[in-house]
């Protein structure tokens, strides 16, 4: 028998730096985790202790934290080249800047092979991106062999910007083949390496014949044996293990996200490849593992940078931005009108000639807006102005509801209206009547939404059977301020960029800013 | 430009050590393994084992452990070889050089100067 | 440990000829190994990695090929520079070993 350790990563989304326990800025020093220094040492650690190591990310390394929007993917390749990592798969983030923005700062500076089996290449790019990322690399382990094939979420087009150059294929139809093409060249060893989520990482080991291992991401899926470590709750046990439709048992794992843990799972093979046992948990990287000095400083030489940017003028507003509890938690404000229509921007994508645009609604907590930005500084707009509006490091996500879940995610939105609470909803792409003297639950009497298969788009009523893409805060998705209604019925999520980041990216393509109030959120007494 | 600087010939006598040493410049000395090559005179090239600058991480071959100690001094981008119990055996000339990549594209592409180590009482 | 058995040993050759160097492998290094080049009293030079990449700045002249067990370096065209010692050297499990090397000398 023969012995691997697979290590894995995946949405580590720019959490270079240690982060406190919920992923967001490290405030407690003692109390904080993660972080690329802290990452190294515990690599290396197990690569002392033992013989056949391989480190892996499963994609979304891109997007996320001031150092993704300063550096653009240059601080992955330095910090992935340095902590060795043996092979990536592609993330839909990754295409967040363009092709472009892939190809110059990661693919050709990373030491390491980036792979997505599903994704091809047409046009000029075909030659342009040769050879930069690959579908499979076999690497040499110790005395042994080990392919790894990558896929990435066939959903990209719709989540990024990879442009019209690139065909996102089926995950299972493009890597059969891949594998099939390993097995010829005697590799009996296989790792399915990918960003589509958990479900897809399932169907994977279920339907491709010849992986053995399947190493995922996207879904930010938490997988524990015995008692988790932390705040997360586990989706199942580490590894997960599918049973195939030719009969093998397939470990599937996953290591939750944004550096936190570092997964860790031994796998047994006989002489044959087939796998006899594996084995594991994700490794929580809390301040018992100190950070590496080497890494550290690099850090922090890096970061330099960071704070000079935060500073430095980002477009300018010639209106009050008013961001004040008192006005976003009880009507609409255009603070909320701003970052709902930077996030509509952030996502416009003209996947088909039918649709305008495959989202046109926004919703988001009035809680979630944290400060006002007063346009008497000169009009200017920094991301430290922008840092204080939201504060909390989340990001602008994508989900599939229904119109029934968006019906009672606005009769929640004012069920105990009056009492500064921060469910009150700020919108894009819709228009919303309320009636407050009804009782909680009832209060909605209007509720159109801007149609996106339409050439001129305008606003019709909500249909409680239709189903509409919004994009939202991650902690609306989650369930946040009581929206569990949403986190329920949800028909499909998925993790969107870095708030801030989407904010300050609308302020500058418009170089100067006036939201208005404009009736997106009216309220009336009587009929209907 | 890249460039490894190797120190210059050493004369040793039977059972005694020698340190030789690997000084980098033009490029990012943490970010790229060094390696040692041997080179008895007249024969081929012999790989001894790698040593990762930024935390002193080393690999060796095994017919080179207990013969040769890897270590470096970042402050200075400088590799560090010594040999230890010296026999005729040990009479060559040795190289670094530097490797990029880690498991994607493997290959020496900058080499040392060479030191010669010649053995004898 | 993998073996790497170069051959010929030798070989003499006048200019503008084309030569070819082999490489066996005793076991599968999967395309993981490079060709150097070695001028008497000189440092080895890298001319050829993953079996057929060419290094930065090498004439095209040279080409490398192969998979498998068996690899091969060829020198079309042979230029007065390209005389001295020959090494393939495989990057599969350690210790990565390096060919006997190959004289090429001018006829």
């Known amino acids: 028998a023969w012995e691997l350790t697979i290590l894995h990563t995946n949405d580590v989304h720019s959490r270079l730096e240690q982060t406190s326990e919920d992923s967001s800025k490290c405030v407690n020093a003692s109390r904080c985790m993660g972080g690329v220094a802290r990452l190294f040492t515990k690599v290396q650690q197990i690569r002392r202790a033992e013989p056949n190591v391989l480190l892996l990310d499963a994609g979304d390394q891109y997007q996320g934290t001031i150092w993704f929007t300063v550096y653009k993917g240059a601080e992955v390749a330095h910090f992935m080249n340095a902590l060795r990592y043996d092979a990536m798969a592609l993330g839909n983030h990754e295409f967040d800047n363009g092709v472009e923005g892939l190809i110059e700062p990661l693919l050709k500076e990373a030491k390491f092979p980036i792979l997505s089996a599903n994704i091809k290449a047409k046009g000029p790019l075909a030659s342009q991106i040769s050879g930069l990322y690959l579908p499979y690399k076999v690497l040499p382990v110790g005395d042994e062999v080990v392919g790894i094939v990558g896929y990435t979420s066939k959903e990209t087009p719709f989540l990024s910007n990879p442009g019209t150059n690139l065909v996102f294929e089926d995950e299972i139809t493009a890597l059969q083949p891949e594998v099939d093409k390993l097995k010829t060249l005697n590799v009996n060893k296989i790792i399915a390496l990918g960003h589509s989520g958990f479900e897809m990482d399932k169907l994977i080991a279920q339907k491709v014949r010849g992986v053995d291992v399947v190493v995922g991401g996207h879904s930010n899926t938490f997988l524990y044996t015995g008692n988790p470590p932390s705040k997360e709750v586990p989706a199942g046990k580490y590894p997960f293990i599918v049973t195939s439709d030719d009969g093998r048992k397939v470990p599937v794992v996953q290591a939750y996200a944004f550096g936190k843990y570092l997964g860790y799972l031994k796998i047994e093979f006989d002489e044959r490849g087939n796998v006899i046992s594996s084995h594991g948990n994700p490794i929580l990287l809390n301040s018992s593992i100190p950070e590496d000095p080497s890494i550290k400083a690099d850090i922090n030489k890096w970061r330099i940078k960071l704070d000079n940017y935060s500073t430095q003028e980002l477009g300018k507003t010639i209106v009050y931005l008013d961001g004040s509890s008192q006005s976003c938690r009880f009507r609409e404000c255009n603070m909320g009108n701003l970052i709902c229509d930077a996030m509509i921007n952030n996502n416009l994508r003209h996947t088909d000639e039918m649709f305008w645009n495959h989202v046109s609604m926004c919703i988001l907590n009035g809680g979630g807006i944290r400060s006002p930005i007063d346009e008497r500084n000169n009009g200017t707009i920094t991301w430290e102005n922008l840092a204080a509006v939201l504060p909390f490091g989340g990001t602008f996500d994508l989900v599939q509801l229904k119109g029934s879940t968006l019906k009672k995610a606005f009769e929640h939105s004012v069920h105990r209206y009056g009492q500064s609470t921060g469910e009150f909803l700020q919108v894009g792409g819709i228009h919303v009547v309320y009636d407050l003297s009804r009782k909680p639950g009832d209060r909605v009497v209007k509720l159109d939404v801007l149609c996106t298969k339409c050439r001129v788009p305008s606003y019709d009523p909500l249909k409680m059977d239709e189903v509409y893409k919004v994009i939202l805060p991650n902690f609306l998705a989650n369930g946040g301020d009581g929206f569990q209604m949403i986190k329920d019925e949800l028909l499909r999520h998925d993790s969107g960029d870095q708030d801030i980041n989407v904010v300050s990216t609308y302020i500058s393509k418009m170089k100067v800013i006036y939201p208005a109030v404009e009736g997106r959120i009216k309220f009336s007494t009587g009929s209907h | 430009q890249v460039q490894l600087q190797q120190s210059g010939p050493e004369l040793v006598k039977p059972g005694a050590s020698v340190k030789l040493s690997c000084k980098a410049s033009?490029?990012?000395?943490?970010?790229?393994?060094i390696n040692w090559v041997k080179q008895r005179p007249g024969q081929g090239l012999e790989w001894i084992g790698w040593?990762?600058?930024?935390?002193?991480?080393?690999k060796y071959n095994e017919k080179f452990k207990g013969k040769a100690t890897l270590t470096v001094d970042t402050s200075s981008s400088t590799a560090y070889m010594e040999l230890h119990s010296l026999t005729s055996e040990d009479s060559a000339v040795y190289f670094c050089?530097?490797?990029?990549?880690?498991?994607?594209?493997?290959?020496?592409?900058?080499w040392g100067t060479g030191t010669t180590v010649t053995v004898s009482s | 440990d993998i073996q790497m058995t170069q051959s010929p040993a030798s070989l003499s050759a006048s200019v503008g000829e084309t030569v070819t160097i082999t490489c066996r492998a005793s076991?599968?290094?999967?395309?993981?190994l490079a060709w150097y080049q070695q001028k008497q009293g000189k440092s080895p030079q890298l001319l050829v990695y993953?079996?057929?990449t060419l290094a930065d700045g090498v004439p095209s002249r040279f080409s490398g090929s192969g998979s498998g067990t068996q690899y091969s370096l060829k020198i079309n065209s042979l230029q007065p520079e390209d005389f001295g010692s020959y090494y393939c050297?495989?990057?599969?499990?350690?210790?990565?070993?390096f060919g006997g090397g190959t004289e090429l000398e001018i006829k």
């Open positions: 050089a530097r490797k990029e990549g880690y498991r994607g594209d493997w290959y020496f592409d900058v």
């Open positions: 033009g490029y990012t000395f943490t970010s790229y393994d």
């Open positions: 040593i990762y600058p930024r935390d002193g991480f080393t």
């Open positions: 076991g599968n290094v999967h395309n993981y």
């Open positions: 993953n079996a057929k």
């Open positions: 050297q495989h990057f599969w499990s350690t210790p990565w070993t």
